[in-house]
Amino acid sequence: SEVEYRAEVGQNAYLPCFYTPAAPGNLVPVCWGKGACPVFECGNVVLRTDERDVNYWTSRYWLNGDFRKGDVSLTIENVTLADSGIYCCRIQIPGIMNDEKFNLKLVIKPAKVTPAPTRQRDFTAAFPRMLTTRGHGPAETQTLGSLPDINLTQISTLANELRDSRLANDLRDSGATIRIG
């Protein structure tokens, strides 16, 4: 069964990636990219660290953990359906072909709304005045449109789903962890 990580539209997504530095402060460069890990580097880089600090990042992407202790897990802020996909965490260990690379699957779920007779992907049928809100590329923002007769209150019940779940304690054993030295 495939391993994947899930978050809701509007919440923060969390993608775990860890390594154990050989010695405190002896850091290894890491890059995060969109799309599967290439042979070298990361494609579509969203964040990068060097031996000392985070030296490149893009809007909404950050490291929430203590990267100086090897927690290079990626947080993606305020996700949309367009953030669904594969993310590459690459730990750039010195030496030829020594890099450790992890492809993590992130699935973004439409935000919960009420009333909701079906999943949000079926809202077009439920509320014909509305444009479809199923995940269609980077432009979708989950706008529900003007529905004066219906009170559609967005419920934020899953703030950082994975992190708050019982799986959080097991993340370091999930495969995206390596020891250096």
Partner: antibody, heavy 119, light 107 residues
Framework: EVQLQLSGPELVKPGASVKMSCKAS????????MHWMRQKPGQGLEWIGY????????KYNEKIKGKATLTSDKSSSTAYMELSSLTSEDSAVYYC????????????WGQGTLVTVSA | DIVMTQSHKFMSTSVGNRVSITCKAS??????VAWYQQKSGQSPKLLIY???NRYIGVPDRFTGSGSGTDFTFTISSVQTEDLAVYYC?????????FGGGTNLEIK
Amino acid sequence: EVQLQLSGPELVKPGASVKMSCKASGYTFTNYVMHWMRQKPGQGLEWIGYIDPDNDGIKYNEKIKGKATLTSDKSSSTAYMELSSLTSEDSAVYYCARDFGYVDWFPYWGQGTLVTVSA
Amino acid sequence: DIVMTQSHKFMSTSVGNRVSITCKASQDVTTAVAWYQQKSGQSPKLLIYSASNRYIGVPDRFTGSGSGTDFTFTISSVQTEDLAVYYCQQHYSIPPTFGGGTNLEIK
């Protein structure tokens, strides 16, 4: 490993109906919708519709609505497509495909099942 | 429905060459385009999604680019096993629609 196993080829007469199955394994069946596509001989791909096994929500391609009926069975993790009033125009390879999750690109495809409509 | 147009039905190239396949959408689809490879007698295989993101297991020689209405799929160094039909698909709106396909022939 995600796998989608389609039923075997069908040779049917014009006006008849045919029902094909797509058995899913390697993932939680109710977490993803199942899409259906077809490909006529020597032509490109055409989306038929999808079914959400979690709630039986269905959406069809308006251009070919009425031709296909989508159903699913949670207990066996199987999606079904029935094609009715078949004509030679419906001769094609039919595919089931699973999307990545709430986005309409398709990493997982069944092997295809050939439907031939001939008198 | 959004129409996806692949202007070249056939393309011919030699092993080691760089080849680019283009696809044009009838309206703005931002970067919501996927590319598939279909070898003879097989199901389509996802190569690229969201215009430029490579899927797991896809060789680095396959890349995608573009946004809005114009998209390009590139094989940096064509191999014999790349003989196939390549399709673009918009995943911006329902129904998802595919281009007519570009048949890549190896000389």
